[in-house]
Every structure is written in structure tokens, then in C-alpha cells.
Amino acid sequence: QPSVSPGEPSPPSIHPGKSDLIVRVGDEIRLLCTDPGFVKWTFEILDETNENKQNEWITEKAEATNTGKYTCTNKHGLSNSIYVFVRDPAKLFLVDRSLYGKEDNDTLVRCPLTDPEVTNYSLKGCQGKPLPKDLRFIPDPKAGIMIKSVKRAYHRLCLHCSVDQEGKSVLSEKFILKVRPAFKAVPVVSVSKASYLLREGEEFTVTCTIKDVSSSVYSTWKRENSQTKLQEKYNSWHHGDFNYERQATLTISSARVNDSGVFMCYANNTFGSANVTTTLEVVDKGFINIFPMINTTVFVNDGENVDLIVEYEAFPKPEHQQWIYMNRTFTDKWEDYPKSENESNIRYVSELHLTRLKGTEGGTYTFLVSNSDVNAAIAFNVYVNTKPEILTYDRLVNGMLQCVAAGFPEPTIDWYFCPGTEQRCSASVLPVDVQTLNSSGPPFGKLVVQSSIDSSAFKHNGTVECKAYNDVGKTSAYFNFAFKGNNKEQIHPHTLFTP
């Protein structure tokens, strides 16, 4: 019995005065608690408790189930205990078959003994199967057998408590160990689509998939910057032990513009959290936005190729696309394709391939696209750069020499005089009149320039050169002059094309 200093409250004393007591089944259990401030007896076994307010605990005919710890407590909260074994050869174990183990923790197989004097108290596998090699346990006759550091691999392990009694092995009823996995990683979360674009009134539905080792993973859909509870529907599956999957589906049956925003699927377990987001954009009606990939004013040299390229965003998806020139629709020479194969793609590319363009093929090329909500178009102004062509070169009745040239960009006409037989016409002559004439062709056609000089200025035999040039090239025409006495004659003009 414990001893305390005088004046201090002391724990109760129990008779018989020993820590353990062994009685046979059918015998009497008589325990006396002596204390001036006696409060109660408490009996505990296998997580069950009973109380008795009498200071003498009497069980007339002891049964194996009376095995356990008897504790007497006084009004000061001080207590004393005795453990009673009720030896019953027919019931060597008291059993609570509930057996849960948390991964990496110890767990107790509750099979306390009714007879502490049996030997070889241990665990055995069911049907003679061996226990896992790494399974370690510590027996305690009053509590059961403690399995140390439970492994996930022990899940659904079938066990018996075992003792040797009179040379024979006796097994308890079976236990099935149910291991609860420890969370050793954050949940794995994924979303059906990263972004959604809808028209007002359409249904928004997005599914988050959460994977973890146990169904006790927590998950929820949240709207960023909002505390509003979202309506979710769940499906879940166990793909074998420790492989749990949940699908949380968020639905807005008729989306509105103000539903636009970022939605987060959040999951957490005791290890940590993970999240994934999806973006919803709700528009009041569909749209098409066209982006030219080249300048909409295009200059191209005669005979060369050019590709007119546009990218466009279309929602809902485009239904009709066409390229038009001079009110004619191209049936070939163009292609239209989505920018990506992603199912949420709304960006497309259209390309018109113009090959070996002629000077007469300049003009406005228009791309038109439409969907169920809107139409859109973009125009390209194509200018074909052509080398000047001298259309006319004449001596007029008034003595003027006139040269008319056409090309794009607008040609410049220069005049030169070459005295005598010299081939090099270096002396420049200033024109009397220069005019840009309105072409009768399309607005993107060649530009016509007329330039005139006064032939009376020439006093010697020689050649007059009219040279028309632009960024693309140059062309010349020549007037030959010969004087017979005082008369000036124009000998046949001729042209030299200088590329």
C-alpha cells in the first residue's frame, strides 16, 4: 500500500493488498476499499467500464468476463487498483474483435488473458499462414498484444492471439486488421477543362477528379473571392485498397455573365492541400474577332507570290468562311483550320495563297466569316508593283515631245539629250509639263504619268531619251533629231527597255 506524509490526503487501501489477484472461475471475488472519503469502485476491461458505489465489491460466482482492473477512488480523486484474473480453462482470452491500425502507429490486439500463467502468449496468422516477416509485437496479458508500427501491407491481415496451455496451442477467435493509411502526399487533383466559354443561358458543368489513399480526403469547389456555397454532385470509387477516386461535379444550369470568373477545386488531407482552377467566361452573345497576321495593305512585285493570313477568334464555332475578290468567291487557293486541337480552342487560321500575281490582279481581297450569332470581315488591299511601260511617245503638232508611261508605284519620267552620235545621254532636260492621268482600270491598277518637253530647245543633231522608272525597274524611249538646213526632222522614235 502507498505511504504518504501525515496531513496529506492518502489514496484508498484495497484488501487483498496486492496488485494482481488470480481466482478460479466460479469462485467469489471480494474486494474491500478502505477510505474515509470513499467514492466508488470502477471496473475496466476491453474499453468497457462499470461502476459500483459500495465500498465492498462482491462477485459471488466469478466468470472469465470479470477479469480486469478494479479501481477504488476517494473524494480527493486519489485511487488504488488491483487486477483480477478469473482463470477459466474454457475461455483463455477476452476478445474485442474490433481491430483498427493507423499506418506507422502501434495498435492493440485486444485479447487480454484470463490466466497469466499460460506461456508463449503471441500472435499467429490464420489457417497456419505465417505472419509478415517484419511484424513485431509486444504481449501484455492485461491488455492484449501490441503490434508495433503498423504497415499498409498488413491491411486485411487475419490474426489469432495464441497461448500454450498444457503443451497445446490455444487460439483466440480471429481478428482482421484494418489499416487506415497515413496521408504521405497531398491529394492529386485535376479538372475536366482549364477554361470554359459559354453564352448566357447555357449550362456550365465542370468535373474535378480527386485521388487519394482514403475517402477521408476533403474536397470542395470554391469560387475565387467568394464564400458562397456551390452546389456539387459527387461520384466515388475505390480502385482497390488505398486507391480512392472522387469526382466532384459543379453545375450552373443557366450561366449568366456575372457567373464569369475563376473556380477552384480544393482538396486537403492531413499531409497538405492541393488545388486546380478553371476559368469560366460567359458572354451575352457570340463573337468573332479577326486579327490580320500581315499588314492589310500589301505590296507585291509582279509575278511573285503572297499569302494573305488571318487569325480569328470565333465563338460559337465558325460556320461559313470565304475569300472574295472583285465579287468573286475563291473556291480553292485557301485553307482554314483551327489554331489548336484543344477542345476549348476558339482560335482559327485562314490563309489565301496568291501565286504569280499579275499587275491586273491588284485590288481588295476580303475574308468573311460567320457563326450562328455574328458575321465579320476583313479586307486586304493588294498592290502589284510593276515596271513602267511607255504607252506613247510622240512629237505633237505644237512641237512638244510627249511621253506617257504606266506602272506601279507611280513612275517618274526624266528626259535626256545626247548630242551627235554619243550614246550616253547625260544632259538632263527639264519637262515643261508633268501630269498624272486617271487610269480607266481598277483603283489598284497601274498609275499613268504624262510628261512633255519643248523640242525647240534642241539646236543640234542628237537623240532625246524619255526614261520612265520606279522601284521595280525602268524603261526608255528615244527620239532621233537631224537638221537639214534650218529644218528639224524627227527620225523614227524607238525604245530601249532597261530592266
Epitope: S98, K178, R180, S214, H238, T270
Partner: antibody
Framework: QVQLVQSGAEVKKPGSSVKVSCKAS????????ISWVRQAPGQGLEWMGV????????GYAQKFQGRVTITADESTSTAYMELSSLRSEDTAVYYC???????????WGQGTLVTVSS | DIQMTQSPSSLSASVGDRVTITCRAS??????LAWYQQKPGKAPKLLIY???SLQSGVPSRFSGSGSGTDFTLTISSLQPEDFATYYC?????????FGQGTKVEIK
């Protein structure tokens, strides 16, 4: 023998929440799982979820995910089940039971009738 | 989730009759199956666990058998106190499901 004693009957309005308690007496609480099972009038049994009081990490049936919250207070050996956004079809007897993590239910509470009515 | 289908949904029998109730799982659940008895206004009572183990205090006229997907509860000789509704329950994974119940009535 361990007994589970539940709180009394409740009448609730649609859209509100109810919290039912379940106290273990005659034994300890922490070595077991505690589950909640409900039974609508004239209907079968429906498992709602489970908790290990020693850890507090609950698991829920997919039908109730997001609407039920199961908690436990080890110090008082009491488990709680809160069901939110109540509707008339939640009218049922709600039972707590010992077990439910890959196990049967060997001890049951007496049941708590929750009536949802406007 | 694993679905449990119980049959029949109800049966009429007399005292002394042998009664058999079956339960089928939508996938294999090994022997993770329990049977319960429920009387009107009372909580269910565990009869059989692990498909065939008799719960302490339950009369031996109750027995269970089966493994995998097909299970049977047998009452060898029906007693007056056995008229009740019987439920099967699977607990192979964390998510538990019950059969829809079989009501045993007096013929």
C-alpha cells in the same frame, strides 16, 4: 456493455441545419470508429459517414458529401453529425453506431427522429 | 459504390419454418458482409458478421454463409420473436452499403 445515447428528436425548417449528438457510456470511445446511419420512414438503412474520434478525420458517403459534417469530442466521448440545407426528404431516424471502417456495426444508438417541415 | 441486392423483399412464414434470405453484391466483397435484424421503432441488431460468424448473444438458429458476391442468411426454425426486417450490409471498402431489406411476416 458500451451504450450509445443520442440526443432527442428535432423538428427543423427546410434549408436549416440539424446537429445530432451521440454519447458513449459504459466504455471508452477512442479505439473505435463511429458511424452515422439514417432511415427514412418505411425505408431502408443508409450509411452517411464515419469518424475515428481519436483522429477526427471523417469519411462520408458520396450522397452526403458536402452536406454532412461528422465531428467528435474525445474528452466527452461524444460524436456529432450535422446535416445542412435540410429538405423534406431528410426526415428520418438518424442512428449512430460503433464501427464502420471496413467493419460491421455491433452497438447502435437508440436513434434520433429529425422531422423537416415548413 | 458497391450495390447490394436482397431477395425476396418480403416473405410470409410460419413459426418453425426454415427461412432463407439472399444478398448479392455488385462486385466481390470476399466475406465482408453482416446481417442485421430490425424491429419496428428499434435500432438494428447485429446477427452475423464476416458472412458467417455469429455475434455474441445471438441464438444459434441464425446462420450465415457465402463469399464473393452471393450470401445467405438462414433461420433454421423461425420463432415468434424473429418476425422483423432483415438487412445485409457490405463493408469491403470504407464506403458501406446496405441491402434494401427483407420483411419476414407471419403467414
Amino acid at each position: 456493455q458500451v451504450q450509445l445515447v443520442q440526443s432527442g428528436a428535432e423538428v427543423k425548417k427546410p434549408g436549416s441545419s440539424v446537429k445530432v449528438s451521440c454519447k458513449a457510456s459504459g466504455g471508452t470511445f477512442s479505439s473505435y470508429a463511429i458511424s452515422w446511419v439514417r432511415q427514412a420512414p418505411g425505408q431502408g438503412l443508409e450509411w452517411m459517414g464515419v469518424i475515428f474520434p481519436a483522429e477526427g478525420a471523417p469519411g462520408y458517403a458520396q450522397k452526403f458529401q458536402g452536406r454532412v459534417t461528422i465531428t467528435a469530442d474525445e474528452s466527452t466521448s461524444t460524436a456529432y453529425m450535422e446535416l445542412s440545407s435540410l429538405r423534406s426528404e431528410d426526415t428520418a431516424v438518424y442512428y449512430c453506431a460503433r464501427g464502420g471502417y471496413i467493419s460491421d456495426f455491433d452497438v447502435w444508438g437508440q436513434g434520433t427522429l429529425v422531422t423537416v417541415s415548413s | 459504390d458497391i450495390q447490394m441486392t436482397q431477395s425476396p423483399s418480403s416473405l410470409s412464414a410460419s413459426v418453425g419454418d426454415r427461412v432463407t434470405i439472399t444478398c448479392r453484391a455488385s462486385q466481390s466483397i470476399s466475406n465482408y458482409l453482416a446481417w442485421y435484424q430490425q424491429k419496428p421503432g428499434k435500432a438494428p441488431k447485429l446477427l452475423i458478421y464476416d458472412a458467417s460468424s455469429l455475434q455474441s448473444g445471438v441464438p444459434s438458429r441464425f446462420s450465415g454463409s457465402g463469399s464473393g458476391t452471393d450470401f445467405t442468411l438462414t433461420i433454421s426454425s423461425l420463432q415468434p420473436e424473429d418476425f422483423a426486417t432483415y438487412y445485409c450490409q457490405q463493408y469491403y471498402y470504407e464506403s458501406i452499403t446496405f441491402g434494401q431489406g427483407t420483411k419476414v411476416e407471419i403467414k
